[in-house]
């Protein structure tokens, strides 16, 4: 079992870990479709990690600890994009993770509802946006979900940050 998150370190009693859900506007787009702006949240913060020199034989205490600011609760919603002029594919559905709450959690921990957006491929075109992940933390969501080598055009991205939670 992963160790519980650390909020204070003895060496730095004046510093506390923090992790917040920041309101963002996220653009969801796809080549040839009208982009949609949705309100979402991103996890942003500073969580503690440390690494203590090891010994042999190894001590029983954990020498390495890593917490990351990541979704504590999220849900996946369908965002439907209208694609005018495309008779064969008049609409495109995308799954988008809506982050509800964030917290410092063990770096390897699975978020509550994880998975990657079912990204769709297509060259940049009207309504499509350059793709960058909207998550400030670099940890991919584990659990068998496999990212593409790079975000394809049309992947959702952050347009701007809004007010704090």
């Amino acid at each position: 079992a992963a160790p519980p998150p650390i909020n204070k370190l003895a060496l730095f009693p004046d510093k506390s870990a923090w992790c917040e859900a920041k309101n963002i506007t996220q653009i969801v787009g796809h080549s040839g479709c009208e982009a949609k702006s949705i309100q979402n949240r991103a996890c942003l913060g500073q969580c503690f990690s440390y690494s203590v020199p090891n010994t042999f034989p190894q001590s029983t205490e954990s020498l390495v600890h890593c917490d990351s600011c990541m979704p504590a609760q999220s849900m996946w919603e369908i965002v439907t994009l209208e694609c005018p002029g495309h008779e064969e594919v008049p609409r495109v559905d995308k799954l988008v993770e809506k982050i509800l709450h964030c917290s410092c959690q063990a770096c390897g921990k699975e978020p509550s509802h994880e998975g990657l957006s079912v990204y769709v491929q297509g060259e940049d075109g009207p309504g499509s946006q350059p793709g960058t992940h909207p998550h400030p933390h670099p940890h991919p969501h584990p659990g068998g979900q496999t990212p593409e080598p790079e975000d394809p055009p049309g992947a959702p991205h952050t347009e701007e940050e809004g007010a704090e939670d």
């Epitope: 999220s74 849900m75 996946w76 919603e77 369908i78 439907t80 064969e88 594919v89 609409r91 495109v92 559905d93 799954l95 809506k98 509802h113 998975g115 990657l116 957006s117 079912v118 990204y119 769709v120 491929q121 297509g122 068998g144 979900q145 496999t146 990212p147 593409e148 394809p152």
Partner: antibody
Framework: QVQLQESGPGLVKPSQTLSLTCTVS??????????WSWIRQHPGKGLEWIGY???????YYNPSLKSRVTISVDTSKNQFSLKLSSVTAADTAVYYC?????????????WGQGTMVTVSS | QSVLTQPPSVSAAPGQKVTISCSGS????????VSWYQQLPGTAPKLLIY???KRPSGIPDRFSGSKSGTSATLGITRLQTGDEADYYC???????????FGGGTKLTVL
């Protein structure tokens, strides 16, 4: 006319891994434009959605099964596959592969005929 | 226990009309499109309705779909004996972050 065909062992022992393959004919997985799924139906019961895969390899799994499920795609063989680990008798079901209507979530317009998988020792 | 609630069975005479209900909540039917499937005995399900009320090509106009609030309805007119089957509704559930189906309704044509 796109057709789907499931294949794999009909009997799996408890605690082992269930492995099924769906072969797509009459169309190419790698052309994009479709999401591909696995769905199962327990004997005499309703349908349960297992997960999605896109030709690029992106996956999305039902959270209730995610810890045991792996879906993969082999575009060179025009196939996608399901692996379900640590199976129990509760995983006994007819397993279907299906295709979503063009880039829609949850509108499965083409189905395989299904393959019955029994979990028993 | 299915997330979406359907009546276990409905019946009507040939030539009559029948409706099958599918009840959910705001996290599924209330905010997402509904699909309907027909499963004839011993066969795979077949898509009848998608986007609440659209029919794929080849599906006769005897089949119709509608949605109001957190409920959806499948209508079948001019019933035929060949319509005897199990019917399932399906949609996305945002709270569960998964696709969900109803428990199915067995239609008997008397």
């Amino acid at each position: 006319q796109v057709q789907l065909q499931e294949s794999g062992p009909g009997l799996v022992k408890p605690s082992q891994t269930l492995s099924l393959t769906c072969t797509v004919s009459g169309g190419s997985i790698s052309s994009g434009g479709y999401y591909w799924s696995w769905i199962r139906q327990h004997p005499g019961k309703g349908l349960e959605w297992i997960g999605y895969i896109y030709y690029s390899g992106s996956t999305y799994y039902n959270p209730s099964l995610k810890s045991r499920v792996t879906i993969s795609v082999d575009t060179s063989k025009n196939q996608f596959s399901l692996k379900l680990s640590s199976v129990t008798a509760a995983d006994t079901a007819v397993y279907y592969c299906a295709r979503d209507a063009p880039l829609r979530i949850g509108a499965f317009d083409i189905w395989g005929q299904g393959t019955m998988v029994t979990v028993s020792s | 226990q299915s997330v979406l609630t359907q009546p276990p069975s409905v019946s009507a005479a040939p030539g009559q009309k029948v409706t099958i209900s599918c009840s959910g909540s705001s996290s599924n039917i209330g905010n997402n499109y509904v699909s309907w499937y027909q499963q004839l005995p011993g066969t795979a399900p077949k898509l009848l309705i998608y986007d609440n009320n659209k029919r794929p090509s080849g599906i006769p106009d005897r089949f119709s779909g509608s949605k109001s609030g957190t409920s959806a309805t499948l209508g079948i007119t001019r019933l035929q004996t060949g319509d005897e089957a199990d019917y399932y509704c399906g949609t996305w559930d945002s709270s569960l972050s998964a696709g969900v189906f109803g428990g199915g309704t067995k239609l008997t044509v008397l």
